[in-house]
Interface confidence: medium
Amino acid sequence: FDLVDYEEVLGKLGIYDADGDGDFDVDDAKVLLGLKERSTSEPAVPPEEAEPHTEPEEQVPVEAEPQNIEDEAKEQIQSLLHEMVHAEHVEGEDLQQEDGPTGEPQQEDDEFLMATDVDDRFETLEPEVSHEETEHSYHVEETVSQDCNQDMEEMMSEQENPDSSEPVVEDERLHHDTDDVTYQVYEEQAVYEPLENEGIEITEVTAPPEDNPVEDSQVIVEEVSIFPVEEQQEVPPETNRKTDDPEQKAKVKKKKPKLLNKFDKTIKAELDAAEKLRKRGKIEEAVNAFKELVRKYPQSPRARYGKAQCEDDLAEKRRSNEVLRGAIETYQEVASLPDVPADLLKLSLKRRSDRQQFLGHMRGSLLTLQRLVQLFPNDTSLKNDLGVGYLLIGDNDNAKKVYEEVLSVTPNDGFAKVHYGFILKAQNKIAESIPYLKEGIESGDPGTDDGRFYFHLGDAMQRVGNKEAYKWYELGHKRGHFASVWQRSLYNVNGLKAQPWWTPKETGYTELVKSLERNWKLIRDEGLAVMDKAKGLFLPEDENLREKGDWSQFTLWQQGRRNENACKGAPKTCTLLEKFPETTGCRRGQIKYSIMHPGTHVWPHTGPTNCRLRMHLGLVIPKEGCKIRCANETKTWEEGKVLIFDDSFEHEVWQDASSFRLIFIVDVWHPELTPQQRRSLPAI
């Protein structure tokens, strides 16, 4: 919709909804940018170290900074802030109206693109959660740890997260499934999730079972890479690779942030005492201590910032969205106080932006990032964050401008390069995207070691006939983004048997295969009838997977949901399939007819998940010219026969016959997934 239907939500779901957002129907819980339409909760545990590291290269050397920052720059900052503070003041409010909360609606609902509100993006699932599924996430490494000051002015990046120099925002178990059509379109390509939330400690994160009944509170986690959970850290691997680089070290150690103004230095002992409580994890006591300091010293930026951090910590501890909204508001208050040290201002607004993203307040986060860039125009990393902010709301054009600007000033910025390449690829500027993606990944800069960049670099290279593609897939595999060079899906459950081609016996779904093969003519005839009478039900593939040709699909089920309208066109086929929950209940797949016309070539591509296997039943197969390659083995279809392959492996299709090819595609759960996993895995 365009809006959440709160009448449907309130009173029916309880405070914490297993799928963590606001969908109208639990079985229809689809996530858009981490949100759905119905529930009043959203999973996502904020990270342990939540505060962004300051951008060292941006800070003025300590010696150079006036004691109380009462120079022109400070005045500019203050006037800019006062101008902008009011524009965003309401964001933290949580207005409860008759038909539900509207203060800071969270995201677009995937049906009507209406604003939605979600009461809690912190998951309250039971602790016994299995952590088996790996999900590729989008990282932008965190730049300042939440404990950004040990002795108020110590450079925390040296203590806690020595090598980061970009803000981390990592997609946090929020799956963003678009509407059905879009998913039909996306289903054969890895789905790229937004950089919504901050880097999390994977071992603590739970994934929402997006499509399941609310009662299913145990969930499978999709981890950030294919390594075992224990190996996951908040600090992404590329930052570690950079530690030996003296330049990088120099960058990080350039300057300690100045967090105290003249007045705060006079109350440093009190601030230290309160901070010590927070550092020791005595959050409630720390909150009270900082509240008291704010009461006593309402103009103290550092006291206010401490209060914000405590609220932030408390929100994490209680998994409370309401508390986090308060923290976001308090970070804002820091910025509106007089005489705020530039470093503290930056930390506070960066953290605010990050937490806004965590809550799905993408637009609000973007406004905060815009303010940051206005306040600190020379900080490249903030511009990079701003670019991501634009990407998160689908504004590729503005993101592109931002990265062009960054690259005009710092042509070797790897983060800007990969993102710029990413945007070019999205615009189908395949050849142009390659050098940016390649050089960006090669830079090793924080935020560049992301599976999607390898995925798209390889894909771009394949499309221009560059054999180097597999070198990058290999590297992506080595760095933990892909299960193997061939198997490059990004939503994976670890440990599932991985082979490109399967026999019916190996799947265990022999009854389904038999039924399909016995009834193939019935299935074929219904498909042909739809082609004749309601051709419009066959929707063209528009995911840019084709080099050339004509390929359309008519979908009966997707995300485990029957399309009633479609089933009117193929009623017997739908009835036949109802007996097989391994396919009708496969929320990570579809059941559909696929028609491909002569002269079609589908680029090598990879499906999004290893959780399904794909059956192809031949319905109308020309004598010659039609073939499918999965990994390094190529096969042909036969009428009335089922082929089974794992589409998380690279596959490619050719249709060089003289007439159309019609097949019936039936996705099934990977046989090794447990019933619990099948219930809990979020839909794709």
Partner: antibody
């Protein structure tokens, strides 16, 4: 090019039904939620109803709830508004409008306003 | 959510700056769009989500505000800008338009 064309409206007596249609062309109709918006003579715009991209969900303004039904046929690229129990206050120009959306690998999609409108069709409810 | 727009009519000469106003009875955050309608024509979207210009919207149009108060502006009125302007919220059901502000030539 991208366009929406409403069917002819007409004059109808109070209490009688009328069905409006809106033919879409130049874009993937089945990917977009669609709205009906109306405008009484000399008055402002009034939102009427919306239907999801696949026709599975709809919402209505209080003034038309229970009387009007929005639907779509994606195979025909057509949006409908079935108006029953018409009243004189339903008189006006009825517009169909598309919900703009964009997608990319980061955000999947994002709202762009009601970005394409039909030319409007006049409905007059009078005895 | 009730939307109010002021003034009902704004009479200005060309090349002058026009500032409109839209208020909402509840916080709609940034979920507010502006539409322009000329006599006998369908509306067209100018900005969505407060400040984002739609494709084809000239740079002289800008939007600002958040929560309950919004003020779009036209930096320098062109002859083609004289029209009725509507704000619309999508923060909660039912979606609603404001009553409109007519910008006419002084």
């Amino acid at each position: 090019q991208v366009q929406l064309v409403e069917s002819e409206g007409g004059v109808v007596q109070p209490g009688r039904p009328l069905r409006l249609s809106c033919a879409a062309s130049g874009f993937t109709f089945s990917s977009h939620a669609m709205h009906w918006v109306r405008q009484a003579p000399g008055k402002g715009l009034e939102w009427v109803a919306v239907v999801s991209h696949d026709g599975s969900r709809d919402r209505y303004a209080g003034s038309v709830k229970g009387r009007f039904t929005i639907s779509r046929d994606n195979s025909k690229n057509t949006l409908y508004l079935q108006m029953n129990s018409l009243r004189p206050e339903d008189t006006g120009v009825y517009y169909c409008a598309r919900v703009g959306r964009s997608s990319n690998w980061f955000s999947r999609y994002y709202y762009y306003g009601m970005d394409v409108w039909g030319q409007g069709t006049t409905v007059t409810v009078s005895s | 959510i009730v939307l109010t727009q002021s003034p009902a009519t704004l009479s200005l000469p060309p090349r002058e700056r026009a500032t409109l106003s839209c208020g909402t009875s509840q916080n709609v955050s940034h979920y507010l769009a502006w539409y322009q309608q000329k006599p006998g024509r369908a509306p067209r979207v100018l900005t969505y989500d407060v400040a984002n210009r739609a494709a084809g919207t000239p740079a002289r149009f800008s939007g600002s505000g958040s929560g309950t108060d919004f003020t779009p502006a036209i930096s320098s009125l062109e002859p083609e800008d004289f029209a009725v302007y509507y704000c619309q919220q999508r923060s909660n059901w039912p979606q609603a338009f404001g009553p409109g502000t007519k910008v006419d030539i002084k």
